[in-house]
């Protein structure tokens, strides 16, 4: 795995411990919480990031709140089980043996049950809608400039292939970014849209996951884009299975 050789850190994930104990004395970085080796040339999976977040000291954790509006976080933060590739296991359980099924971005998609609950497969989230509302500005941003800047951001900062940014819609003050990535479209090495969306969400909140970089300074033709509300919605390849008695917290 590649990492900055000089000071042995992971540029794409600050929630890691790195040391020069890889093959040939190369820098190797492991995610906090899971101890799994991570590839520092690309984004770390959301599952490993959540696990690392939950392993942080409690007082540090309170500094990073779950997204209060996004439907993704109805159940708040939890300590997930990740598979050997760092993906969410289809079934998640807590310490009191309450279990539920999740999708590929770790969002609950069934009612909660007990240890007998079966989750046959990890259902893929293939469409993500990121809904941003920006703070008032002197005038509307130019749609083409905004579109280009957001596509550049996802390509360069999050290493997401441009073909997965399906659309950028804008009517002041609302910006919608649609990410689409079917199972058949995602090749080996492609960044997952769920991981890109999670890094973006944390960036927007001023909680960047990148090592040592300044926070996200989003500008459109020099004009700062300041976000006042962020909502992220997920659409799965197979619809979720909630009963009529679904909790309405």
């Amino acid at each position: 795995h590649t990492a900055a050789q000089d000071n042995c850190t992971c540029p794409t994930n600050k929630m890691t411990v790195c040391s020069p104990d890889g093959p040939g004395g190369r820098c190797q970085c492991r995610a906090l919480g899971s101890g799994m080796a991570v590839d520092c040339s690309t984004l770390t999976s959301k599952c490993l990031l959540l696990k690392a977040r939950m392993s942080a000291p409690k007082n540090a954790r309170t500094l990073v709140r779950p997204s209060e509006h996004a439907l993704v976080d109805n159940d708040g933060l939890y300590d997930p089980d990740c598979d050997p590739e760092g993906r969410f296991k289809a079934r998640q359980c807590n310490q009191t043996s309450v279990c539920w099924c999740v999708n590929s971005v770790g969002v609950r998609r069934t009612d909660k049950g007990d240890l007998s609950l079966r989750c046959d497969e990890l259902v893929r989230t293939h469409h993500i809608l990121i809904d941003l509302r920006h703070r008032p500005t002197a005038g509307a941003f130019n749609h083409s400039d905004l579109d280009a800047e957001l596509r550049r951001l996802f390509r360069e900062r999050y290493r997401l292939h441009p073909k997965f940014v399906a659309a950028v819609h804008y009517e002041q003050p609302t910006i919608q970014i649609e990410l689409r990535q079917n199972t058949s479209q995602k090749a080996a090495g492609d960044v997952d849209i769920g991981d890109a969306a999670y890094y973006f969400e944390r960036d927007i909140k001023g909680e960047s996951l990148f090592q040592g970089r300044g926070g996200l300074d989003l500008r459109v033709r020099g004009e700062p884009l300041q976000v006042e509300r962020t909502l992220i919605y997920y659409l799965d390849e197979i619809p979720p299975k909630f009963s009529m008695k679904r909790l309405t917290a």
Epitope: A167, E171, T174
Partner: antibody, heavy 119, light 110 residues
């Protein structure tokens, strides 16, 4: 000029399923949030939920489990289904478009369709 | 029981100003600048008069003015006219990512 038109049966029996369709004409269904709102006789407005043109939905928790919204971009329609209706579901049902891609203000409304639930 | 509280009725004479209040909590009206106001004449669909607390859509008279202080939003109508007689509803985005409406206020022009 974008217009919305609600259609569907006006009379239902308790426990039946309410099915309404909102047809969008004079414009595209793309990228907007499309809401259903109802108004019970002599009472105020109640937000039922919205669907985005992508198919993503958000429902009022008080109706969760009974409501299903879908979208048919080829027909420029977004249907509403409410299961297991009771007399409390008797209302005028409106479909509406979110203003400028937002989900919390509605600039274009249908004329509304009255639905009565009675045995 | 509506999530947002409005007076059941208000009245005023032609030419006067009236104000309709809409009281919520810090989880809706107080927490966001996403308050809207609608006018509804009998047998008609609601019409958007104010959005984002104080913004008027094009075509809405500048006699309609929206504002907010704390957990209470207000709609002020100046130079009252006979055609302003209608029901008025406020709405607000909420912290649970839903939309709440007020119970409505009947405006009578005397």
């Amino acid at each position: 000029q974008l217009q919305l038109q609600e259609s569907g049966p006006g009379l239902l029996k308790p426990s039946e399923t309410l099915s309404l369709i909102c047809t969008v004409s004079g414009g595209s269904i793309s990228s907007h949030y499309w809401s259903w709102i109802r108004q019970t006789p002599g009472k105020g407005l109640e937000w039922i939920g919205w669907i985005h043109s992508s198919g993503i939905t958000n429902y009022n928790p008080s109706l969760m489990g009974r409501v299903t919204m879908s979208v048919d971009t080829s027909k420029n329609q977004f249907p509403l289904k409410v299961n297991s209706v009771t007399a409390a579901d008797t209302a005028v049902y409106y479909c509406a478009r979110g203003l400028r891609l937002t989900d919390d203000a509605f600039d274009i409304w249908g004329q509304g369709t009255m639905v009565t639930v009675s045995s | 029981q509506s999530a947002l509280t409005q007076p059941a009725s208000v009245s005023g004479s032609p030419g006067q100003s009236i104000t309709i209040s809409c009281t919520g909590t810090s989880s809706d009206v107080g927490g966001y600048n996403y308050v809207s106001w609608y006018q509804q004449h009998p047998g008609k669909a609601p019409k958007l008069m104010i959005h984002d607390v104080s913004n008027r859509p094009s075509g809405v008279s500048n006699r309609f003015f929206g504002s907010k202080s704390g957990n209470t939003a207000s709609l002020t109508i100046s130079g009252l006219q006979a055609e302003d007689e209608a029901d008025y509803y406020c709405s607000s985005y909420t912290s649970s990512n839903t939309l709440a409406f007020g119970g409505g206020t009947k405006l009578t022009v005397l």
